[in-house]
């Protein structure tokens, strides 16, 4: 409608690391003579319309979302209706709607993408002694407490991708963070290096682990 309050949010998702604070930006253009007494602001979960935080009747009504949200009170009068979400959790991921009502009303939805980096993979070998060329071994690459689910890639010492005989499992813990275990079954050559790369698709962060088998003994590269 003509003259309806225009509510603006970022088009791209806001990416926030687990445990950090995130700002969900939202703005509107106040008309001349605007006062906070005219403003009714509602932040809500888009899908359910559950209340997250509100500013009505000229005052901040506080957080309705685990007491982890806050507005920027000094900036509201300039049209900054952004929401601060503290100590981000995996469960916070999703769409939030900023609903602004002054003389008329408008709304816009902003997406929150939660992320957590994966730990440096630990490598284990089974069996891990008396290895000879021709033996079949299983190499397990484990990386912990990341989000969202990882992409896992294996390669040999020459950088050739290894795609056969790979089994990857990802399990979420009680916080929703994933532990990834990827198992490569290979037939040993005279010697060889096997690397696993655990990629966080949101952070574009790669965590590398490798094991080098040189007949006997077997060596693990030092931790980076």
């Amino acid at each position: 409608p003509t003259g309806a309050v225009e509510v603006q949010v970022p088009e791209d998702p806001v990416v926030a690391l687990v445990g950090t604070d995130a700002t969900l930006r939202c703005s509107f253009s106040p008309e001349p003579g605007f006062s906070l007494a005219q403003l009714n602001l509602i932040w809500q979960l888009t899908d359910t319309k559950q209340l997250v935080h509100s500013f009505t009747e000229g005052r901040d009504q506080g957080s309705a979302y685990a007491n982890r949200t806050a507005l920027f009170p000094d900036l509201l009068a300039q049209g900054n209706a952004s929401l601060r979400l503290q100590r981000v959790r995996v469960a916070d991921e999703g769409s939030f709607t900023c609903f602004v009502s002054i003389r008329d009303f408008g709304s816009a939805a902003v997406s929150l993408q939660v992320a957590a980096p994966y730990s440096k993979p630990s490598m284990t070998l089974e069996p891990n002694k008396d290895l000879r060329p021709g033996d079949t071994v299983t190499i397990t690459c484990s990386s912990y407490r990341g989000y969202p689910e990882a992409e896992v890639f294996w390669q040999d010492g020459q950088g050739v991708p290894l795609t056969g005989n790979v089994t990857t499992s990802q399990m979420a813990n009680e916080q929703g963070l994933f532990d990834v275990h990827s198992v490569l079954r290979v037939v040993l050559g005279a010697n060889g290096t096997y690397s696993c790369l655990v990629r966080n698709p949101v952070l574009q962060q790669d965590a590398h682990g490798s094991v080098t088998i040189t007949g006997q003994p077997m060596t693990f590269p030092p931790e980076a």
């Epitope: 359910t48 769409s95 009502s101 939805a109």
Partner: antibody
Framework: QVQLVQSGAEVKKPGSSVKVSCKAS????????INWVRQAPGQGLEWMGG????????NYAQKFQGRVTITADESTSTAYMELSSLRSDDTAVYYC?????????????????WGQGTTVTVSS | DIQMTQEPSLTTSPGGTVTLTCRSS?????????ANWVQEKPGQAPRGLIG???KRAPGTPARFSGSLIGGKAALTITGVQPEDEAIYFC?????????FGGGTKLEIK
């Protein structure tokens, strides 16, 4: 259970105005958006505008801008829709429908409660 | 102006499954459009069936379900009953206004 009860049928002359009421019984108008939707004979549903009674703020479809005024009286849980400069093609059934601004139950049922409709006939 | 497209008419048989869709001229329908589905029968006021894309309104039978399919809002009726013969309208929210589709007339033969 909330019910929306609308005022009775109206017959109006071209150029005049009509004011239709919508009273919420068994509940409150807050925190909701009361929408006004019309249906001309043999046509589909058309959103005209809506009001948030708690805030007293209204929006209108561009087509009706300047010709429709939507108001609400929180004390009587009643919303009103006034349409002016009536023409014959405004002959229609006018409905109010409740939509939640904030879903207090945590579930967004959308436009789940509708009034029974008010027939407005514009004829000279 | 925002245009919304629904199938003008669909025919199904009792006990069958039918899916009605609602396409927006602005692009893919998302959860922030809060797709609503409204049923209208002759001589009766419209009845809200589905809100918020997939939430059944109180009293809506379980055979009605809402979803997003291929960028469109969809209403699926599983195990169609003769009393489901009606016109079904979708409505989408765009920041500050609702827009209704033209309606789908569902015939049961």
């Amino acid at each position: 259970q909330v019910q929306l009860v609308q005022s009775g049928a109206e017959v109006k002359k071209p150029g005049s105005s009509v004011k239709v009421s919508c009273k919420a019984s068994g509940g409150t108008l807050r925190p909701v958006l009361i929408n006004w939707v019309r249906q001309a004979p043999g046509q589909g549903l058309e959103w005209m505008g809506g009001i948030i009674p708690l805030f007293g703020t209204a929006n209108y479809a561009q087509k009706f801008q300047g010709r429709v005024t939507i108001t609400a009286d929180e004390s009587t849980s009643t919303a009103y829709m006034e349409l002016s400069s009536l023409r014959s093609d405004d002959t229609a059934v006018y409905y109010c429908a409740r939509d939640q601004v904030v879903a207090t139950s945590g579930v967004n049922f959308g436009m789940d409660v509708w009034g029974q409709g008010t027939t407005v006939t514009v004829s000279s | 102006d925002i245009q919304m497209t629904q199938e003008p008419s669909l025919t199904t048989s009792p006990g069958g499954t039918v899916t009605l869709t609602c396409r927006s001229s602005t692009g893919a329908v998302t959860t922030s459009n809060y797709a609503n589905w409204v049923q209208e029968k002759p001589g009766q006021a419209p009845r809200g069936l589905i809100g918020g894309t997939n939430k059944r309104a109180p009293g809506t039978p379980a055979r009605f379900s809402g979803s997003l399919i291929g960028g469109k809002a969809a209403l699926t009726i599983t195990g169609v009953q003769p009393e489901d013969e009606a016109i079904y309208f979708c409505a989408l929210w765009y920041s500050n206004l609702w827009v209704f589709g033209g309606g789908t007339k569902l015939e049961i033969k």
